[in-house]
Amino acid sequence: TPEVWVQVQMEATELSSFTVHCGFLGPGSISLVTVSWGGPDGAGGTKLAVLHPELGTRQWAPARQARWETQSSISLALEDSGASSPFANTTFCCKFASFPEGSWESCGSLPPSSDPGLSAPPTPVPILRADLAGILGLSGVLLFGCGYLLHLLRRQKHRPTPRLQPSHTNSQALTAQAWAPSQASQAALHDPYATINTSFCPATLDTAHPNGWASLPTHAAHQPQGPAASASTPILARGSFVSVENGLYTQAGERPPHTGPGLTLFPDCRGPRAVEGRFGVR
């Protein structure tokens, strides 16, 4: 069953800056992501950004930059102009639509205990996006490495070791987490097998696109910049969550920039490559 996770992060260097990270753990092909605040989209929430895997992104103040991080996760940077920092008490929701199967949404907020002065130690948890063998191998190595490091710390410094938890921390940012999986079994968050599914749809899908969204030009594929660039390299500087991909996507970030009617396309907009034969040509 699909899962949606939401994580809200406050920048330690700029206390007025927030980033919302969202991801989809499921077998479907994402057709649209909507980020809202104040509640779920369509249920009292206000849209902050809409990210379409082909047509680009559209955002509204106070959203500063919305972008795809991987084929199944996005991030939205927010600029809090108010001195009272209203974001600290705001609920952010992310809705992942997989047309026509359904839409899944989850919400999260900045934990009230967030204190920029207390920086949590980095917790290396990789984004698992490679094949299953890579996943298992990488996990084993990292777990062993973490265990060994903790063992050394325990022996040498004789002090309690920090509890491992998913987070987005590095030298630049303090992560304040809002872990909000969907109501499906939480076992999927701990057991990679729980989110591995076969192809969601057969090759005979009868899915048509609107005439209003004309066929899009194809440009040379480009690789994403930043920590999500490599699908085979673990991200150690920034903790993340287990994200088992469907296996039918191409490498993360292979997204030619496109524009569509009424959509503002940002330079770093990228997302899942359309997979023909699953939901038709997008």
């Epitope: 989209d41 249920a43 047309f99 839409s103 899944w104 949404e105 696109h209």
Partner: antibody, heavy 122, light 106 residues
Framework: EVQLVQSGAEVKKPGASVKVSCKAS????????IYWVRQAPGQGLEWMGT????????SYNQKFRGRVTMTRDTSTSTVYMELSSLRSEDTAVYYC???????????????WGQGTLVTVSS | QNVLTQSPATLSLSPGERATLSCSAG?????LHWFQQKPGQAPRLLIY???NLASGVPARFSGSGSGTDYTLTISSLEPEDFAVYYC?????????FGQGTKLEIK
């Protein structure tokens, strides 16, 4: 209050076409997909297709391929389902429904139209 | 298409009894939805994603299952529960419903 109001009953001859409307109110029309289900007398439910009201994308049951067309008019918050080349076995109640969004810790609700009876008879 | 087979076709029980309705898929599905339909009315979402209660649905309803076998359970039948129940899969196109289980008063 969320409402889906469908057009009235229709009697059609074999080979003709029928266009059923579904007018939505009480929510932002483009925030939710609409799907169509039909139910022949005394029979079960049959999914016909889904339309994404925000971008007009559609997905149809291949059983109706080439015969069904779903459209939407955002100015009137109305979705239309047209079925052509009607035959007697198309006699059924046709329902439109607002697709639900599965949201954690929030109520998940679906809404349905009252149904439109389409009778195909010579 | 993925055929969903519901059993039994008809279930005759009395108020207060426990009802168990089954839905078997021809091929594995990721999750299942259950709908309730009363005569002359449109269907109503009862359980989504296998085991989650839709808004306003009493806690006596529960769902379970995985793969190809799913179950809807009503712990203690109330008079208003007698209706037709349909399961639906959305794991592959076309989406399909089971043929329905009619729950009638004994």
């Amino acid at each position: 209050e969320v409402q889906l109001v469908q057009s009235g009953a229709e009697v059609k001859k074999p080979g003709a076409s029928v266009k059923v409307s579904c007018k939505a109110s009480g929510y932002t029309f483009t925030d939710y997909w609409i799907y169509w289900v039909r139910q022949a007398p005394g029979q079960g439910l049959e999914w016909m297709g889904t339309i994404d009201t925000s971008d007009h994308k559609t997905s149809y049951n291949q059983k109706f391929r080439g015969r069904v067309t779903m459209t939407r008019d955002t100015s009137t918050s109305t979705v239309y389902m047209e079925l052509s080349s009607l035959r007697s076995e198309d006699t059924a109640v046709y329902y439109c429904a607002r697709d639900f969004i599965i949201t954690v810790n929030y109520p998940v609700v679906d809404y349905w139209g009252q149904g439109t009876l389409v009778t195909v008879s010579s | 298409q993925n055929v969903l087979t519901q059993s039994p076709a008809t279930l005759s029980l009395s108020p207060g009894e426990r009802a168990t309705l089954s839905c078997s898929a021809g091929s594995s599905v990721n999750y299942l939805h259950w709908f309730q339909q009363k005569p002359g009315q449109a269907p109503r979402l009862l359980i989504y994603s296998t085991s989650n209660l839709a808004s306003g649905v009493p806690a006596r309803f529960s769902g379970s299952g995985s793969g190809t076998d799913y179950t809807l359970t009503i712990s203690s039948l109330e008079p208003e529960d007698f209706a037709v129940y349909y399961c639906q899969q959305r794991s592959s196109l076309p989406f399909t419903f089971g043929q329905g289980t009619k729950l009638e008063i004994k």
